[in-house]
């Protein structure tokens, strides 16, 4: 019961997380104009991964797509790639985890197969979450760097009499959505991996039992009951073949160096 709950919760949390990653990727407010130096502006700028927008105080908003690939900063391209990879992995993970859910019966699917699928989807969710967190963090780092560079430029040149106020950008709502969504996907993935332990039949080492036949004595040693993973309990005395799933020790986390802001 606890396994089913953990798996179900992991699925729901991951689903919310991936929906959040998709939302963040599509949002226009990755960076928003910093109003600290000009709180009374009648024109507000904000930018996303795919287009930049200008909202006038009159209420009119105009958005322009980035209609170039080669002319865009490499970092922006990298962030786009990370977010798309995160979405694709998450979507595949969701698809796999639907079939892996204990509450859903598909034909005569063995528990071991469900355990394998649960682990696979869990790893996919973890990597998906890491991709989203990495993408958002790279963008945030880029913003911080640009912010301080433009601040430095603001007070130099023309003997301090700068007429053109440089537009500085700060963190937009999409960054926070992305961080939270990535975290949720990551947590959902971990929960799926934990659920996998409970789903998998335990490796059972049966003691040799002597069966005394009426005629002559024969010692029968049942063997070959190697479970696909070393977790959970296998109450049924049936042969389970190794499906190639990883054990907990094999599950890799993918640490990556990020500049967190």
């Amino acid at each position: 019961m606890a396994v089913t709950a953990c798996q179900g919760l992991g699925f729901v949390v991951s689903l919310i997380g991936i929906a959040g990653i998709i939302a963040a990727t599509c949002m226009d407010q990755w960076s928003t104009q910093d109003l600290y130096n000009n709180p009374v502006t009648a024109v507000f700028n904000y930018q996303g991964l795919w287009r930049s927008c200008v909202r006038e105080s009159s209420g009119f908003t105009e958005c322009r797509g980035y209609f170039t690939l080669l002319g865009l900063p490499a970092m922006l391209q990298a962030v786009r790639a990370l977010m798309i990879v995160g979405i694709v992995l998450g979507a595949i993970g969701l698809l796999v985890s639907i079939f892996a859910l204990k509450c859903i019966r598909i034909g005569s699917m063995e528990d071991s197969a469900k355990a394998n699928m649960t682990l696979t989807s869990g790893i996919m969710f973890i990597v998906s979450g890491l991709c989203a967190i990495a993408g958002v963090s790279v963008f945030a780092n880029m913003l911080v760097t640009n912010f301080w560079m433009s601040t430095a430029n603001m007070y130099t040149g023309m003997g301090g009499m700068v007429q053109t106020v440089q537009t500085r950008y700060t963190f937009g709502a999409a960054l926070f959505v992305g961080w939270v969504a990535g975290g949720l996907t990551l947590i959902g993935g971990v929960m799926m991996c934990i659920a996998c332990r409970g789903l998998a039949p335990e490796e059972t080492n049966y003691k040799a039992v002597s069966y005394h036949a009426s005629g002559h004595s024969v010692a029968y040693k049942p063997g070959g009951f190697k479970a696909s993973t070393g977790f959970g309990s296998n109450t049924k005395n049936k042969k389970i073949y190794d499906g190639g799933a990883r054990t907990e020790d094999e599950v890799q986390s993918y640490p990556s160096k990020h500049d967190y802001v």
Epitope: N38, V43, Q47, S58, G59, T164, T167
Partner: antibody, heavy 118, light 113 residues
Framework: QVQLVQSGAEVKKPGASVKVSCKAS????????MNWVKQAPGQGLEWIGQ????????KYNGNFKGRATLTADTSASTAYMELSSLRSEDTAVYFC???????????WGQGTLVTVSS | DIVMTQSPDSLAVSLGERATINCKSS????????????LTWYQQKPGQPPKLLIY???TRDSGVPDRFSGSGSGTDFTLTISSLQAEDVAVYYC?????????FGGGTKVEIK
Amino acid sequence: QVQLVQSGAEVKKPGASVKVSCKASGYAFSNYWMNWVKQAPGQGLEWIGQIYPGNGDTKYNGNFKGRATLTADTSASTAYMELSSLRSEDTAVYFCARYYRGNCFDYWGQGTLVTVSS
Amino acid sequence: DIVMTQSPDSLAVSLGERATINCKSSQSLLNSGNQKNYLTWYQQKPGQPPKLLIYWASTRDSGVPDRFSGSGSGTDFTLTISSLQAEDVAVYYCQNAYTYPLTFGGGTKVEIK
């Protein structure tokens, strides 16, 4: 077509208040900011403030803050500007104007002359 | 507040001739987000409310004759009437549409010589 029709001329004594109305027609009144502009006799234009009828949000020019009050009645598609503690320098024509793309004033009322005289 | 300075205060031009009005702002009106200048031009005839001519420094409002054109960027802007007509006699105002409070220039009176 878009029309902004303002109330008639007013003569007030110093220290009194005046409330000028601006009735809008021909567009969705709630969806556009309404601005108020002052023009003293033989002088230029001075922005007083603006109101968004949809939610009552207002922005004021610091020179008028505290003395000018902007309100709107969406059911009557009418915007109001009340100016209190009137003084002689408030004698002017007051215009209402719709705020449009490019943060410009695309349609204007005909103007209301407010005369402050003892 | 952004200060808008118009020059000249008045201008006398012969019919059919070119009239040029200048407007200078104390701060740049160029928005980096869309590369548009938030400067507006209005025409006001005696006894009438102002009429919108040009917004975004160079975009003519619908129904405005093409003899009116706006140019300039940043802090320096120009309104040009390529061939002055009798009906163009009016006071012309420039307006900062970039930062609150929205401010107007002092106006330029255009007359026929």
